[in-house]
């Protein structure tokens, strides 16, 4: 996250960190006790079974008692994910256990299925453990920045026509650099307490106003998300699972 600030620890309890070989790699967010949403491109060249998902974290390198760590039992990328264009850049991670909900671990609500994205100018927040500058500086803890929704046609023009309708864009609202950076991928764009966007890609420089930040528009995938979650719930399974609605 560039141009942002460190959040109050555990004030974004839905945040998940996906790590490989002990290093944070991508973000994600908890929507169900067994499921985290992340970006499909995070797993294009990584074996999901080698990854770990950490919930309840603030400073990832600190051994916080609130942290819950899971391996990835299954990673379900959207069947129409296109690495060449990053279209349909969304992935569901099934945890190998059930998250224990509490003050530091909570679910994030999804938008209504096929809901219109927030109007241009709407203030939203994106958070993550990604770099805080183009120098690839790691953050001291979970970071967040306020951004504004940008009209998709304006954004598509800035991106030389590369976007599709299931994407969402934000900008700083001024000329300053504010937005996400490398390793924020998969994290949520929260508008009105719902995950309307999922961090997908940005331009040459983090927060560059000329190439606005691009997100997967979550509302376009809500049906798919719950279809996957439902399909994986075995009829004979016991124990209560909770989902955000």
């Amino acid at each position: 996250i560039v141009g942002g600030h460190e959040v109050t620890p555990h004030s974004r309890p839905y945040m998940a960190s996906v790590s490989f070989e002990g290093h944070h790699y991508c973000g994600g967010f908890l929507i169900h006790t067994h499921w985290v949403v992340s970006a499909a491109h995070c797993f294009s060249d990584r074996d999901p079974s080698m990854g770990l998902v950490v919930l309840g974290a603030h400073a990832l390198l600190a051994p916080e008692p609130t942290q819950q760590t899971f391996s990835i039992a299954a990673a379900v990328s959207h069947p129409d994910f296109q690495p060449a264009t990053q279209a349909n850049d969304i992935c569901l991670l099934r945890l190998n256990g059930s998250a224990v909900l509490g003050p530091a671990v909570r679910l994030l609500r999804l938008p209504r299925r096929n809901a219109k994205p927030p109007a241009a100018g709407t203030r939203c927040h994106v958070s993550g453990w990604g770099f805080v500058s183009d120098f690839e500086e790691p953050p001291p803890g979970l970071m967040e920045v306020e951004v504004r929704i940008l009209d998709l046609s304006v954004c598509n023009s800035s991106w030389q026509g590369q976007l599709n309708p299931a994407m969402l864009c934000t900008h700083s609202g001024d000329r300053r650099r504010r937005g996400f950076c490398s390793a924020d991928s998969g994290g949520p764009l929260v508008c009105g307490r719902r995950a309307h966007g999922l961090v997908s890609f940005s331009g040459l420089w983090c927060g560059d106003p000329k190439t606005p930040d691009v997100y997967t528009q979550v509302s376009a995938f809500v049906t798919w998300i719950w279809d996957v979650v439902r399909a994986s719930s075995s009829p004979g399974s016991t124990g209560r699972s909770v989902r955000a609605v």
């Epitope: 491109h41 294009s44 690495p83 183009d134 490398s182 890609f201 040459l204 420089w205 983090c206």
Partner: antibody, heavy 119, light 107 residues
Framework: EVQLVESGGGLVQPGGSLRLSCAAS????????IHWVRQAPGKGLEWVAW????????YYADSVKGRFTISADTSKNTAYLQMNSLRAEDTAVYYC????????????WGQGTLVTVSS | DIQMTQSPSSLSASVGDRVTITCRAS??????VAWYQQKPGKAPKLLIY???FLYSGVPSRFSGSGSGTDFTLTISSLQPEDFATYYC?????????FGQGTKVEIK
């Protein structure tokens, strides 16, 4: 040792096409953005195009937009520049360059390949 | 696009001289400026990034300074191998743009 080696340059008539290649070694291709920068004879440097580390995103200079296409094959550690509808003003040495950090600067450059557009 | 204007376009200097090249951006680019050295028939080489950070392996006689719109590359004591053309480049906003170059020649 980091190396970038361009190939594919040559003489082409106006309106023709060429495909340049940039073979990378000594670094993780998928961890760094790749750029093409050109230099017309006796002139300065002009940035042409960029492809993101994932290969999923691209951006072009206005002067080549719609005519040039940058792509990458991460399995081959190679980037490409497909140049169509070539014009005389595209005559230049074309360099591929690797990003330092998150595109802060270009820290490694290839030796360049000359593209001449002439009838 | 942001214009980067270098001055002078060329200069003559002797070995041991202190040489200063300036670069002015058409708008604020913070400290997102790099400097390159290029010799005839060769690819550019990175000297300085983020206005003042010396790139690995570059001799300490090279230094950079500035922020906002005005930037400077200084060679504290010119060496025979330093005769070349120098370019500044902004990496603040898309597209990246270069200065027109400053040719440093032997007096």
């Amino acid at each position: 040792e980091v190396q970038l080696v361009e190939s594919g340059g040559g003489l082409v008539q106006p309106g023709g096409s060429l495909r340049l290649s940039c073979a990378a070694s000594g670094f993780t291709f998928s961890g760094s953005g790749i750029h093409w920068v050109r230099q017309a004879p006796g002139k300065g440097l002009e940035w042409v195009a960029w492809i993101s580390p994932t290969g999923g995103n691209t951006y072009y200079a206005d002067s080549v937009k719609g005519r040039f296409t940058i792509s990458a094959d991460t399995s081959k550690n190679t980037a490409y520049l497909q140049m169509n509808s070539l014009r005389a003003e595209d005559t230049a040495v074309y360099y591929c360059a690797k990003s330092l950090f998150h595109n802060v600067a270009f820290d490694y450059w290839g030796q360049g390949t000359l593209v001449t557009v002439s009838s | 696009d942001i214009q980067m204007t270098q001055s002078p376009s060329s200069l003559s200097a002797s070995v041991g001289d202190r040489v200063t090249i300036t670069c002015r951006a058409s708008q604020d680019v913070s400290t997102a400026v790099a400097w390159y050295q290029q010799k005839p028939g060769k690819a550019p080489k990175l000297l300085i990034y983020s206005a003042s950070f010396l790139y690995s392996g570059v001799p300490s006689r090279f230094s950079g300074s500035g922020s906002g719109t005005d930037f400077t590359l200084t060679i504290s004591s010119l060496q025979p191998e330093d005769f070349a053309t120098y370019y500044c480049q902004q990496s603040y906003t898309t597209p990246p743009t270069f200065g027109q170059g400053t040719k440093v020649e032997i007096k």
